[in-house]
């Protein structure tokens, strides 16, 4: 096969959007329909993302850059560049196999997504539950048992007003 | 479905030329590059050109340039390969192929192939 | 032109045996390299485009590897009917090379 070469690899002139077309010479041609380079001095084209399905289009492809895909309503994204879709659950909830169920007694989940985590064990860090966990809520810990002797208390309830002219009994 | 349908078997003396054709249906004819390959007996794969049949561009390998003619015939759907001064070294299958899809990461790859054109070459 | 060569030339493996073909390219070919099976009717079918993209039809028992000038085809399991010789190409440059083939028997 006859070419006259240079020393610069002629495709490296192809900008984005474009392809070194082997076939003609190394001619610069327009990325077909549906497909895009978002590099300069390709051989080929890539072939555009569709969003379907599950997915849905959030910015539509060009010749120079890729579609990009979310997820429709019920569903987030997992993945790099949203590469699987996940079904949503409640709060209090967590995807198996066999669909949404509730947290175990003992954990939890914030979030429409992931799975249901302990609850704190507030005994660790040596403090007390302050306020119980939920299915959807975690523990509130608070100050440790010690610093609630007796006469003590964990809050300290404002003085009584006075009122004007008169003395304590 | 794809198919290319090829012309059959041909026996030639030395020095005579050979025309096979190439019948391409399935797909639309105009916008895949039409390859010929050959397989000489016992032996590998042989890259011969190709043709764009929207507007008869070719390529050709410098061993064949300046004996095989490519063409082809769009009201067919009909791509031709002729050999010419035809030796006894050019027997072998000739095979045409459809090119991926144009511009596109499988463009240079051969994804479909006809059944393959016995010439035989002998005085 | 850009050589291809092809290893091994010939092997013999058993039915569900993993078997593995290289390849390798005069140069660096970009990925644009393909694999291609011929039966010994002689007939000719595109496995593997672009280094690891199956083609269409084509049992997820085969795959393909590589970047550079060196590729790899693997049959994960081999069945009695991939008995065939299979040729890589490369698409990178004109003209369009292919490796000298692989011959592989069932033993």
């Known amino acids: 096969f006859e070419r006259t070469r240079s020393l610069q690899d002629p495709c490296s002139n192809c900008p984005a959007g474009t392809f070194c077309d082997n076939n003609r010479n190394q001619i610069c041609s327009p990325c077909p329909p549906n497909s895009f380079s978002s590099a300069g001095g390709q051989r080929t084209c890539d072939i555009c993302r569709q969003c379907k399905g599950v997915f849905r289009t959030r910015k539509e492809c060009s010749s120079t850059s890729n579609a990009e895909c979310d997820c429709t309503p019920g569903f987030h994204c997992l993945g790099a560049g949203c590469s699987m879709c996940e079904q949503d659950c409640k709060q209090g909830q967590e995807l198996t196999k066999k669909g949404c169920k509730d947290c175990c007694f003992g954990t939890f989940n914030d979030q429409k997504r992931g799975i249901c985590r302990p609850w704190t064990n507030c005994s660790l860090d040596g403090k007390s539950v302050l306020v119980n966990g939920t299915k959807e809520r975690d523990v509130v810990c608070g100050p440790s048992p010690a610093d609630l002797s007796p006469g003590a208390s964990s809050v300290t309830p404002p003085a009584p007003a006075r009122e004007p002219g008169h003395s304590p009994q | 479905q794809v198919q290319l349908v090829q012309s059959g078997a041909e026996v030639k003396k030395p020095g005579a030329s050979v025309k096979v054709s190439c019948k391409a249906s399935g797909y639309t004819f105009t916008s895949y590059w039409i390859n010929w390959v050959r397989q000489a007996p016992g032996q590998g794969l042989e890259w011969m050109g190709n043709i764009y049949p929207s507007d008869s561009y070719t390529n050709y390998d410098q061993k064949f340039k300046d004996r095989v003619t490519m063409t082809r015939d769009t009201s067919t759907s009909t791509v031709y390969m002729e050999l010419s001064s035809l030796r006894s070294e050019d027997t072998a299958v000739y095979y045409c192929t459809k090119s991926g899809e144009y511009g596109k990461i499988g463009y240079y790859a051969m994804d479909y192939w006809g059944q393959g054109t016995t010439v035989t070459v002998s005085s | 032109d850009i050589q291809m060569t092809q290893s091994p030339s010939s092997l013999s493996a058993s039915v569900g045996d993993r078997v593995t073909i290289t390849c390798r390219a005069s140069?660096?070919?970009?990925?644009?390299l393909n694999w291609y099976q011929q039966k010994p009717d002689k007939t000719v079918k595109l496995l593997i485009y672009y280094t690891s993209r199956l083609h269409s039809g084509v049992p997820s028992r085969f795959s393909g590897s590589g970047s550079g000038t060196d590729y790899t085809l693997t049959i994960s399991s081999l069945q009695p009917e991939d008995i065939a010789t299979y040729y890589c190409q490369q698409g990178n440059t004109l003209p369009y090379t292919f490796g000298q083939g692989t011959k592989l028997e069932i033993k």
């Open positions: 140069q660096d070919i970009s990925n644009y």
